[in-house]
Amino acid sequence: MHVAQPAVVLASSRGVASFVCEYGSSGNAAEVRVTVLRQAGSQMTEVCAATYTVEDELAFLDDSTCTGTSSGNKVNLTIQGLRAMDTGLYICKVELMYPPPYYVGMGNGTQIYVIDPEPCPDSD
Amino acid sequence: MHVAQPAVVLASSRGVASFVCEYGSSGNAAEVRVTVLRQAGSQMTEVCAATYTVEDELAFLDDSTCTGTSSGNKVNLTIQGLRAMDTGLYICKVELMYPPPYYVGMGNGTQIYVIDPEPCPDSD
């Protein structure tokens, strides 16, 4: 299954990056799982994941670094709390869980660049 | 796809439990992903996951609680660092990632029992 996401995104000075993850619809996908993975070398680590249904809204865990909204076969993802050391390739994985058949697809990744802000000067 | 695993395993006094996860081979599976999930009520949490290829050995992340070896359609899984509170149902999920078609299957779970060792008496 084809998954599309932007090639590059620049995080805001507050360490927030947003991008859209779009998947090829099988039509009646009622339960969809979206996972954001960070690739470093040959290693992949899970950043966050959420399952949503055709009836209910996308919901990440309360303590997740991600938030998101879903609309049809598009998911708007926002990753917060990013620092320069988090610069890297973030891959969107989409699983059409239900009803059968199960489909899975991964995007080519979004390179997120994060620049730490300069510390504020001491006020006199 | 059928996945078989033992019903019950008793962890060693060092908190190590090993079991075999066997899947119905589709023959030419070149890339296989094995995930160990812990089921608590209706919740499932991922314990560890690894992808291996027909050419390379199974490799979990360095900081993973799991290690393993693969042989054909059998995977020998070892979970370390278990404590009594980790007693529960551990489900083996196998995904035949490549080549297509994609197959996925889950075992019925292995109930792992963990007994914390008695603390050693102070030596005089």
Epitope: S25, S26, G27, N28, A30, E31, R33, T51, T53, V54, E55, E95, M97, Y98, P99, P100, Y102 | L37, Q39, S42, Q43, M44, K93, V104, G105, M106, N108
Partner: antibody, heavy 116, light 112 residues
Framework: QIQLVQSGPELKKPGETVKISCKAS????????MNWVKQAPGKGLKWMGW????????TYADDFKGRVAFSLETSASTAFLQINNLKNEDTATYFC?????????WGQGTTLTVSS | DVLMTQTPLSLPVSLGDQASISCRSS???????????LEWYLQKPGQSPKLLIY???SRFSGVPDRFSGSGSGTDFTLKISRVEAEDLGVYYC?????????FGGGTKLEIK
């Protein structure tokens, strides 16, 4: 509001064909699968299968493979159940029901009587 | 196929009583996603079935909170805390985890 409205009662002879319709309104038709359920007189519910309203691909329960066919007229947001070569045991009420992760809205049912 | 067995077949109750209906599946109905697609429906005479509970314990909108679902794996229960006259009818469990999806045989809730 969401509604599924089915066609009226049918009286058929053995060997004939029937086509029952289920018209959906109040939601995006192609976002939800359409299921069909049979209920023989005085009996329980039996799942017949479902059709993917986006791709048109049907899935049939084993007991309903062969003489039963699901189809769509997407432009009219309508699903159809056709039963060929009718038999007496096809006498029942047939329900359509939409499904995402639950059968949340049902048609009113269509009663089919097969009698010579 | 997954066989769904409901007990009892008939459940005579007095209004205001608690009622409990059991549904047992012939195999685990946990789907590969980890979700369990176990639902409960009520059918009143001459009407279409109505959804009460989905995914084991989630109450559908508009369903009174006297209805609750519980269970896991192969054993599931629907409880009605205080039966009212409008609750009478036939209750069906349904599994949507493994194709073919299947209904239980039904439990008739009636006045004692």
């Amino acid at each position: 509001q969401i509604q599924l409205v089915q066609s009226g009662p049918e009286l058929k002879k053995p060997g004939e064909t029937v086509k029952i319709s289920c018209k959906a309104s109040g939601y995006t038709f192609t976002n939800y699968g359409m299921n069909w359920v049979k209920q023989a007189p005085g009996k329980g519910l039996k799942w017949m299968g479902w059709i993917n309203t986006y791709t048109g691909e049907p899935t049939y329960a084993d007991d309903f493979k062969g003489r039963v066919a699901f189809s769509l007229e997407t432009s009219a947001s309508t699903a159809f159940l056709q039963i060929n070569n009718l038999k007496n045991e096809d006498t029942a009420t047939y329900f359509c029901a939409r499904r995402g992760v639950r059968l949340d809205y049902w048609g009113q049912g269509t009663t089919l009587t097969v009698s010579s | 196929d997954v066989l769904m067995t409901q007990t009892p077949l008939s459940l005579p109750v007095s209004l205001g009583d608690q009622a409990s209906i059991s549904c047992r599946s012939s195999q685990s109905i946990v789907y590969i996603s980890g979700s369990t697609y176990l639902e409960w429906y009520l059918q009143k005479p001459g009407q279409s079935p109505k959804l009460l509970i989905y995914k084991v314990s989630s109450r559908f909108s508009g369903v009174p909170d006297r209805f609750s679902g519980s269970g896991s794996g192969t054993d599931f229960t629907l409880k009605i805390s205080r039966v009212e006259a409008e609750d009478l009818g036939v209750y069906y469990c349904f599994q949507g985890s493994h194709v073919p999806w299947t209904f239980g045989g039904g439990t008739k809730l009636e006045i004692k």
